[in-house]
């Protein structure tokens, strides 16, 4: 006769492991008992369980409640056992010793491999600001057994670097994603993808990029110079910019206080019916936590009763 077993049995942490040991004997042969033991190198064999044809299953105190026979129907030549709720410490070499009649004793070894699926974590890097050089956007760490694979899925252009740390029964892998921040990256997803044989599907953690920036400011409203004449109603100046975080707007007049009746509404400066007193240099000040910008315009309100022509100068400054 001969023993049938597996070279390697692989289970995921927490699952039940079937340790196979089947005696394929000639007709009339019987199995008296099957003894299972840990057989790791450097340690004496530690009995796990003994499956006796007459006295039943005996289990070592160290494995009490964790070793069982497979459910019926059972073949008397089958010495397989179930190891419930596999833990990392169960990983290693196992030996089954089968005592048969009249052929004698047989033994076989198998290796139990316990996969420990990773629990990945993603840590964003420092605040991203336009104008920075190559900067850490995020790092992703996953620890498991065997070592997991950590990659990135994104439309954003960047570079990755990985390092791993081996522990006694597992390995931790950390991958970093570096990029040169630009405003076009704002709101873009950066996804860490972790693969592992103990996972049914890849684990994905997504981080949304936030890049601080502030665009140049400009003022709209003076495109048609002929509209800025005494008596005109509804005249307004609008300050244009964009940023992350969204900027705030402030209006001032360079050559004096804002004339009475001029309304500030965020990015918009609203004028009452125009008079020549509204002529002057107006400054839009745009700011967020990242930066600030200024844009100034010169308003000349034309009085049709005067011969002089109207002039408008547009100046932008940062």
């Amino acid at each position: 006769g001969e023993l049938e077993t597996s070279d390697v049995v692989t289970v995921v942490l927490g699952q039940d492991a079937k340790l196979p040991c089947f005696y394929r004997g000639d007709s009339g042969e019987q199995v008296g008992q099957v003894a299972w033991a840990r057989a790791d190198a450097g340690e004496g064999a530690q009995e796990l369980a003994l499956l006796h044809s007459k006295y039943g299953l005996h289990v070592s105190p160290a494995y009490e409640g964790r070793v069982e026979q497979p459910p019926p129907p059972r073949n008397p030549l089958d010495g397989s056992v179930l190891l419930r709720n596999a833990v990392q410490a169960d990983e290693g070499e196992y030996e089954c010793r089968v005592s048969t009649f009249p052929a004698g004793s047989f033994q076989a070894r198998l290796r139990l491999r316990v996969l420990v699926p990773p629990l990945p974590s993603l840590n964003p890097g420092p605040a991203l600001e336009e104008g920075q050089g190559l900067t850490l956007a995020a790092s992703c760490t996953a620890e498991g057994s065997p070592a997991p694979s950590v990659t990135w899925d994104t439309e954003v252009k960047g570079t990755t670097s990985s390092r791993s740390f081996k522990h006694s029964r597992s390995a931790a892998v950390t991958s970093e994603f570096h990029l040169v921040p630009s405003r076009s990256m704002n709101g873009q997803p950066l996804t860490c993808v972790v693969s592992h044989p103990g996972l049914l599907q890849d684990q994905r953690i997504t981080h949304i990029l936030h890049v601080s920036f502030l665009a140049e400011a400009s003022v709209r409203g003076l495109e048609d110079q002929n509209l800025w004449h005494v008596g005109r109603e509804g005249a307004m100046l609008k300050c244009l910019s964009e940023g992350q975080p969204p900027p705030s707007y402030n209006w001032t007049r360079l050559d004096g206080p804002l004339p009475s009746g001029v309304r500030v509404d965020g990015d918009t400066l609203g004028f009452p019916p125009l008079t020549t007193e509204h002529s002057g240099i107006y400054v839009c000040h745009v700011s967020n936590e990242f930066s600030s910008r200024d844009s100034q315009v010169t308003v000349d309100v034309l009085d049709p009763q005067e011969d002089s022509g109207k002039q408008v100068d547009l100046v932008s400054a940062s």
Epitope: Q33, A35, Q46, H52, Y55, H58
Partner: nanobody, 117 residues
């Protein structure tokens, strides 16, 4: 041949405890399986507990959580600690030893355990 000598039986009230001992005439470390059967009047003999040379143990479902089996290699003795005894535990308790796998077991003479309600 292995001689087995039991002791520790007796009369006890329900909820009480007893400790049975089984001393073997040869090293229990080399005995494949040792343990205890019991036989109540008019019933079949049933396996109560067993312990292997490698230290693995078996307890019948009816006694799990109440009985424990242990072995002292230095004294060549196997013990059955019986706690929370019930009237249905009343029986003659026999020590057995299978010296070599497949051989007929050696038996002790039996010790009476009586649990009164």
């Amino acid at each position: 041949e292995v001689q087995l000598v039991e002791s520790g039986g007796g009369l006890v009230q329900a909820g009480g405890f007893l400790r049975l001992s089984c001393a073997a005439s040869r090293s229990v470390f080399r005995i494949n399986v040792m343990g205890w059967y019991r036989q109540a009047p008019g019933k079949q003999r049933e396996l109560v507990a067993g312990i292997t040379s490698g230290g693995s143990r078996r307890l019948a479902d009816s006694v799990k959580g109440r009985f424990t089996i242990s072995r002292d290699n230095a004294k060549n003795t196997v013990y059955l600690q019986m706690n929370s005894l019930k009237p249905e535990d009343t029986a003659v308790y026999y020590c057995f030893a299978e010296a070599v796998v497949g051989d007929e077991p050696y038996w002790g003479q039996g010790t009476q355990v009586t649990v009164s309600s």
